[in-house]
Interface confidence: low
């Protein structure tokens, strides 16, 4: 597994790692994905000026990226473990189509993009094992996802670059919020 940033100090621990608890494993998995997103964002920002662009709103109209809201119960005020966990899983399931879109958007980081996608699938599985109320989790409609993917891929080059940047930024923010919330569970 990749080495999460700032983890070097843990490397000099006892010679045999103990099996990770469910929470540690989820925490570690999210940090792996965030590490991968950082690498992808680096390539995106080096390739275009999207990261400094003020025209994000133009592209954002085409996207319906998951975001944390007060009602989701993931913030410190009004924290609700069950509601929040449902939101995190639902959000990750919704992000999957956008991660699929990212698969052909990278040259030097193509493998990293696939790793982020696969790691997210595993994270969803971890969280589903943790969730008690799986019935409350809505799975995105495959037909809707397929047409969204087609629509995103049909955009002009500028919009595709902007979409890539926005997906990575939003996914990073969503995961960071999830990480904070999961540490309270």
């Amino acid at each position: 597994a990749p080495v999460p940033p700032g983890e070097d100090s843990k490397d000099v621990a006892a010679p045999h790692r103990q099996p990770l608890t469910s929470s540690e494993r989820i925490d570690k998995q999210i940090r792996y994905i965030l590490d991968g997103i950082s690498a992808l964002r680096k390539e995106t920002c080096n390739k275009s000026n999207m990261c400094e662009s003020s025209k994000e709103a133009l592209a954002e109209n085409n996207l319906n990226l998951p975001k944390m809201a007060e009602k989701d119960g993931c913030f410190q005020s009004g924290f609700n473990e069950e509601t929040c966990l449902v939101k995190i899983i639902t959000g990750l399931l919704e992000f999957e189509v956008y991660l699929e879109y990212l698969q052909n958007r990278f040259e030097s980081s193509e493998e990293q993009a696939r790793a982020v996608q696969m790691s997210t699938k595993v994270l969803i599985q971890f969280l589903q094992k943790k969730a008690k109320n799986l019935d409350a989790i809505t799975t995105p409609d495959p037909t809707t996802n397929a047409s969204l993917l087609t629509k995103l891929q049909a955009q002009n080059q500028w919009l595709q670059d902007m979409t890539t940047h926005l997906i990575l930024r939003s996914f990073k923010e969503f995961l960071q919020s999830s990480l904070r919330a999961l540490r309270q569970m």
Partner: antibody, heavy 119, light 106 residues
Framework: QVQLQQSGAELAKPGASVKMSCKAS????????MHWIKQRPGQGLEWIGY????????EFNQKFNDKATLTADRSSSTAYMQLNSLTSEDSAVYYC????????????WGQGTTLTVSS | IVMTQTPKFLLVSAGDRVTITCKAS??????VAWYQQKPGQSPKLLIY???NRYSGVPDRFTGSGNGTDFTFTISTVQAEDLAVYFC?????????FGGGTKLEIK
């Protein structure tokens, strides 16, 4: 694409030491742990240990604690395994394998280095 | 942790369904992988985290399990599936492999 190129076959005498290499390409060497696995002819696979190339920290199957030393050279993206005090039991194919992004599974393997220990 | 893999040998015809099992000496959660090693080649990862197919692996290969008992299935064996199959636990170090199952095609 990801490739792990291992050094050629080795013939060594009992009691000697040998150092084999595994050159990584197609990915960021320091991001992924590198595992080493032993396979004796017609037998199963035995996990020896891994090294974190980013820090040099390694962890072993206790059985190989005094047998193997793992190192990594970040400048050449190469991992090394040294085996000492060789006996005929060490005759085997040794694989380096990159740790997968999503757990401690090995997703890319080198072609293997055959070690023959004989007097 | 000891991974006991059965059977050791399988002689099947193309088109058959094949099941290999691996029993862990203690719970390994779902931290199990399955590898395929064709003659003269290095092992290849097929299944990880108990049931996830690795990228590019045909969907005739599936994995399942319950913590200590794990099953690997090839729904319709093809001639190119001639290989040795290994399970591996990565729940805790030292990571251990099953003894392998040699699949031969009639």
């Amino acid at each position: 694409q990801v490739q792990l190129q291992q050094s050629g076959a080795e013939l060594a005498k009992p009691g000697a030491s040998v150092k084999m290499s595994c050159k990584a390409s197609g990915y960021t060497f320091t991001t992924y742990w590198m595992h080493w696995i032993k396979q004796r002819p017609g037998q199963g696979l035995e996990w020896i240990g891994y090294i974190n190339p980013s820090t040099g920290y390694s962890e072993f199957n206790q059985k190989f604690n005094d047998k193997a030393t793992l190192t990594a050279d970040r400048s050449s993206s190469t991992a090394y395994m040294q085996l000492n005090s060789l006996t005929s039991e060490d005759s085997a194919v040794y694989y380096c394998a990159r740790d997968a992004y999503y757990g401690n599974y090995e997703d890319y393997w080198g072609q293997g280095t055959t070690l023959t220990v004989s007097s | 942790i000891v991974m006991t893999q059965t059977p050791k040998f399988l002689l099947v015809s193309a088109g058959d369904r094949v099941t290999i099992t691996c029993k862990a000496s203690q719970s390994v959660s779902y931290d199990v992988a399955w590898y395929q090693q064709k003659p003269g080649q290095s092992p290849k990862l097929l299944i990880y985290y108990e049931s996830n197919r690795y990228s590019g692996v045909p969907d005739r290969f599936t994995g399942s399990g319950n913590g200590t008992d794990f099953t690997f299935t090839i729904s319709t064996v093809q001639a190119e599936d001639l290989a040795v199959y290994f399970c591996q636990q990565v729940y805790t170090s030292p990571y251990t492999f099953g003894g392998g199952t040699k699949l031969e095609i009639k």
